[in-house]
């Protein structure tokens, strides 16, 4: 999480700040959505439990050519301790369920806001 601020950051970003910034980006995506997000692309649903940041990234990284979620993908990579590449799948994916990116983002946002309110940042 120390790298989330990027090169311009004066120092490590507190986990609560990093989570708040991710939430704000997801809010931004949901509020600015006019046409179907990522052309209605479908992604694997995930279990919103421990390890969900990597699972979320593994799902979203398979969506290509969608500038709206590029910043989210970068931010999620800061929460995931290992390198994630397209085609990777963890046990946290609900492998028989695909949902639209817009719904995925909405579900993720709701869960992250509750984690923030409860003080669970890692």
């Amino acid at each position: 999480l120390t790298c989330l601020g990027g090169f311009a950051s004066p120092g490590p970003v507190p986990p609560s700040t990093a989570l708040r910034e991710l939430i704000e980006e997801l809010v931004n995506i949901t509020q600015n959505q006019k046409a179907p997000l990522c052309n209605g692309s479908m992604v694997w649903s995930i279990n919103l439990t421990a390890g969900m940041y990597c699972a979320a990234l593994e799902s979203l990284i398979n969506v290509s050519g969608c500038s709206a979620i590029e910043k989210t993908q970068r931010m999620l990579s800061g929460f995931c301790p290992h390198k994630v590449s397209a085609g990777q799948f963890s046990s946290l994916h609900v492998r028989d369920t695909k949902i639209e990116v817009a719904q995925f983002v909405k579900d993720l946002l709701l869960h992250l806001k509750k984690l923030f309110r409860e003080g669970q940042f890692n």
Epitope: H111, K113, K114, R117, E118, G119, F121
Partner: antibody, heavy 120, light 112 residues
Framework: EVQLVESGGGLVQPGGSLRLSCAAS????????IHWVRQAPGKGLEWIGR????????KYDPKFQGRFTISADNAKNSAYLQMNSLRAEDTAVYYC?????????????WGQGTLVTVSS | DIQMTQSPSSLSASVGDRVTITCRSS???????????LEWYQQKPGKAPKLLIY???NRFSGVPSRFSGSGSGTDFTLTISSLQPEDFATYYC?????????FGGGTKVEIK
């Protein structure tokens, strides 16, 4: 229009049980937290506990843990307060309230309250 | 548990008066996410409480500007700059930072 409506209050004997309901409309309870708060006659407000209906994560004031149980039914868009081993001092108006939906910073909507009287 | 101590428990005032209610927490109510979840609620007899102020100093939508909140750490204040007839009620502070959440004992504002 957002609304919370409590029901299930009434007269119960000491040692008895009661289940209060909080029916929500105008929003999905999974999107927020539902809290239970009570107020004894002429007294102040007491926070009992809350539930996150999205995952059944429940927190209580330890004072109520064990005797009181909070639950939710997402299909019915309702939350519940099961009260067991009731005592005279549990006589109060019981309210449900929701956390606002943006950052869950405060209680923006409350029910009208339901009166529970514990007496023989 | 965090105790929220309100003072005074009651006060008599006249329309137009400036009223100040204080609330002291037994320990810091700064949440681990950096926010201070200190709220003020107004309650009238037979009615559910209504939110006035959240996160110490933010006025809830529709709340008149005569209501203001301030404070930090463990000491907080609700001020009514010019008391109106509809303001006679009981006021509660509330901390939503640390579970179990807790209310203050209330301050009843009565007509002098």
């Amino acid at each position: 229009e957002v609304q919370l409506v409590e029901s299930g209050g009434g007269l119960v004997q000491p040692g008895g049980s009661l289940r209060l309901s909080c029916a929500a409309s105008g929003f999905n309870i999974k999107d927020t937290y539902i809290h239970w708060v009570r107020q004894a006659p002429g007294k102040g407000l007491e926070w009992i506990g809350r539930i996150d209906p999205a995952n059944d994560n429940i927190k209580y004031d330890p004072k109520f843990q064990g005797r009181f149980t909070i639950s939710a039914d997402n299909a019915k868009n309702s939350a519940y307060l099961q009260m067991n081993s009731l005592r005279a001092e549990d006589t109060a108006v019981y309210y449900c309230a929701r956390s606002e939906e943006n950052w869950y910073d405060f209680f923006d909507y409350w029910g009208q309250g339901t009166l529970v009287t514990v007496s023989s | 548990d965090i105790q929220m101590t309100q003072s005074p428990s009651s006060l008599s005032a006249s329309v137009g008066d400036r009223v100040t209610i204080t609330c002291r927490s037994s320990q810091s109510i700064v949440h681990s996410n950096g926010n201070t979840y200190l709220e003020w609620y107004q309650q009238k007899p037979g009615k559910a409480p209504k939110l006035l102020i959240y996160k110490v100093s933010n006025r809830f939508s529709g709340v008149p500007s005569r209501f203001s909140g301030s404070g930090s750490g463990t000491d907080f204040t609700l001020t009514i700059s010019s008391l109106q007839p509809e303001d006679f009620a009981t006021y509660y502070c509330f901390q939503g930072s640390h579970i179990p959440y807790t209310f203050g004992g209330g301050t009843k504002v009565e007509i002098k």
